[in-house]
């Protein structure tokens, strides 16, 4: 579950549950930095702009990332 306006990491809880790529508005992958020592993945859903933090270590989430990047490479000229 995301928490906005934090000075450190954004995600307070993380989910192992995959999301349907078709229901995704945006998928943010925030690399580790001086502010937050871990990678964070934040899914924004089309429905009401709902946000959800995903577990980068989860197999289901890794598969989601592969599917999304595959879809993006299809779209790029």
């Amino acid at each position: 579950v995301p928490l906005s306006r934090t000075v450190r990491c954004t995600c307070i809880s993380i989910s192992n549950q995959p999301v349907n790529p078709r229901s995704l508005e945006k998928l943010e992958i925030i690399p580790a930095s001086q502010f937050c020592p871990r990678v964070e993945i934040i899914a924004t859903m089309k429905k009401k702009g709902e946000k959800r933090c995903l577990n980068p270590e989860s197999k289901a989430i890794k598969n989601l990332l592969k599917a999304v990047s595959k879809e993006m490479s299809k779209r790029s000229p």
């Epitope: 579950v1 995301p2 928490l3 906005s4 306006r5 934090t6 450190r8 990491c9 995600c11 307070i12 809880s13 993380i14 989910s15 192992n16 549950q17 937050c36 020592p37 871990r38 859903m45 429905k47 009401k48 702009g49 709902e50 946000k51 959800r52 933090c53 577990n55």
Partner: antibody, heavy 121, light 109 residues
Framework: QVQLVESGGGVVQPGRSLRLSCAAS????????MHWVRQAPGKGLEWVAL????????YYADSVKGRFTISRDNSKNTLYLQMNSLRAEDTAVYYC??????????????WGQGTTVTVSS | EIVLTQSPGTLSLSPGERATLSCRAS???????LAWYQQKPGQAPRLLIY???SRATGIPDRFSGSGSGTDFTLTISRLEPEDFAVYYC??????????FGPGTKVDIK
């Protein structure tokens, strides 16, 4: 089943310390942010503190900032609240609660039964 | 800090009646971050509604939430005997503290 069990409450004198524990079971504790919420006798709910799933983020209510410390041990599936410099107004039932990890929204979806802290001379 | 005000303080109704509880915020709250809880005497609170309008797991459909911005409502369409309790709203997610409202007590007329 999903469960939170608090312990460590009791009667303590003003100015003294107490450590509360919350044992979690039935879910992936290491994925879940955790809260402490308290309720003074006959009063409403007051949010006390929050810790992120990996312990990096900590947040406190102004009323306890500098006196209380929230921590967790993911290897033991346990949440803690270290309470120092206790005051009479800290007398309350203390609940631990899970931040809902699976939904798109926030909320505290699992609560313990509470442990009572009484600060009295 | 966002302050939540709940009204009325006490609602006296009979089983089968409709209950309408109000929660007002001192500044705008994203509807994604407004929750309602039920608490019975001697028990821990229970999450009823999250995201202002979504029912939590196992919550009967007589409970519904609505609203946006600064005004939110919890409605119990037909009160059952087990619904007489205290109800709290909570704003959550902009930044701490995650304040609760003072509560509305629904008691038997």
């Amino acid at each position: 089943q999903v469960q939170l069990v608090e312990s460590g409450g009791g009667v303590v004198q003003p100015g003294r310390s107490l450590r509360l524990s919350c044992a979690a079971s039935g879910f992936t504790f290491s994925n879940s942010g955790m809260h402490w919420v308290r309720q003074a006798p006959g009063k409403g709910l007051e949010w006390v503190a929050l810790i992120g799933f990996d312990g990096i983020n900590e947040y406190y209510a102004d009323s306890v900032k500098g006196r209380f410390t929230i921590s967790r041990d993911n290897s033991k599936n346990t949440l803690y609240l270290q309470m120092n410099s206790l005051r009479a107004e800290d007398t309350a039932v203390y609940y631990c609660a899970r931040d809902w990890p699976e939904g798109y929204y926030n909320g505290m979806d699992v609560w313990g039964q509470g442990t009572t802290v009484t600060v009295s001379s | 800090e966002i302050v939540l005000t709940q009204s009325p303080g006490t609602l006296s109704l009979s089983p089968g009646e409709r209950a309408t509880l109000s929660c007002r915020a001192s500044q705008s709250v994203s509807s994604s971050y407004l929750a309602w809880y039920q608490q019975k005497p001697g028990q821990a609170p229970r999450l009823l509604i999250y995201g202002a309008s979504s029912r939590a797991t196992g919550i009967p459909d007589r409970f519904s939430g609505s609203g946006s911005g600064t005004d939110f409502t919890l409605t119990i369409s037909r009160l059952e005997p087990e619904d007489f309790a205290v109800y709290y709203c909570q704003q959550y997610g902009s930044s701490p503290p995650f304040t609760f409202g003072p509560g509305t007590k629904v008691d038997i007329k």
